[in-house]
Amino acid sequence: PLATIPVSTTSLTSSEGSTISTPSVDISTPVTTSIVGDQCSRCKNGGFWDGLKCQCLTPYYGESCEEVVNSIDIAPPETVSAQMELTVTVTSVKFTDELKNHSSQEFREFNKTFTEQMNIVYSGIPEYVGVNITNLRLGSVVVEHDVLLRTKYTPEYKTALDNATEVVKQKITKVTTEQIMTNDNCSALMCFNTTGTQVQNITVTQYDPVEECRQKAEEYEDYFLVEYRDQKPYCISPCESGFNASKNCNHGKCQMSQNGARCLCVTTETHWYSGEDCNQGTQKSHHHHHH
């Protein structure tokens, strides 16, 4: 036997003024039907029947996946990062082929000293995580390395990381200008060739909550938007209450359609409500029925 699908109706009036009954299952829309055991379900909009209920795809929900959610979960990363590819020339160490071998004593000691030196140079940058040597080559020692930066995600993360990369440039330029060999002597942990300092490339984490929101909203992308609360982005439709963009339907219910958010106005025992925001009330005339 096929399971009966309960269809409840609510007396609602669209903002155009006509009274409509909105079934929880829209029979007029073609649906895919899957039969599992003796259960039958109509799951719309790509949803599938799991044996008990419809499993809906974002942004849909409801008994038959016929309704559009008011908000979509978007999850920005906890932290965002930047990677700067830099080159500096160290003059206080003689280049040997052993430096190319990352498991050699020469490389390990050079790496330790270079890392210590860079930790000192960048000590005042809160976003600084560390350095990673990618290649060492002749000349005295040309050090190709990455400077790693990280910060907590906030809407302004790009500005924070951009500022940090600028400070990195300033600090590496300063140290490689000041810590130089004089009279064949280097009195610092490491000495540099001023002209060998170059920033090759900067890569910053790309995260756009608006883009994620639009992608997840699919065909409703034009009607979902991102609003922030406590520096956290929320992907909402105008039907979600409590935000700047929230639609106030007064005496009605907000519903998403492919043309955007609209208000379905209620009819009470005493009033009809109409208007785009269901804020125009018309009192019903009272008829006396005699038995």
């Epitope: 003059t91 206080s92 160490v93 003689k94 280049f95 040997t96 004593q105 020469e106 000691e109 050079f110 330790k112 000293t113 210590e116 060999m181 009279n183 064949d184 002597n185 280097c186 009195s187 610092a188 942990l189 000495c191």
Partner: nanobody, 124 residues
């Protein structure tokens, strides 16, 4: 990691001599080596240094009295201290640079390996 172990310290009378030794666990041929000292309540100071190519440097206070040398074959560093004075009393430690370090002709250089030290007390 390079391990450095100092020896030769002790109690000595003013005007006498002492020879400090520093045994390294690895090759010191391609390293700058140095001796440092720290007296109670004072900052650590460079005493003497020797570069990879044998060039030496000394603190003004010890010039003409102390001599630094190294024996690459034995991976050892030495500090010959003559005409010792009461103000030479300190904990003496040896230090080594990273491999292939060049340009360490002054004593302000920061070495990356350092021993525990040996105590020298000059007193009558």
């Amino acid at each position: 990691e390079v391990q450095l172990v100092e020896s030769g310290g002790g109690l000595v009378q003013p005007g006498r001599s002492l020879r400090l030794s520093c045994a390294a666990s690895g090759d010191i041929t391609r390293r700058c080596m140095g001796w440092f000292r720290q007296a109670p309540g004072k900052e650590r100071e460079g005493v003497a240094g020797i570069s990879e190519d044998g060039i030496t440097g000394y603190a003004d206070s010890v010039k003409g009295r102390f001599t630094i040398s190294k024996d690459n074959a034995k991976n050892s560093l030495y500090l010959q201290m003559n005409s010792l004075r009461a103000e030479d009393t300190a904990l003496y430690s040896c230090a080594a640079s990273i491999l292939n370090r060049v340009g360490c002709r002054q004593l302000s250089y920061e070495y990356i390996y350092r021993g525990q030290g040996t105590q020298v007390t000059v007193s009558s």
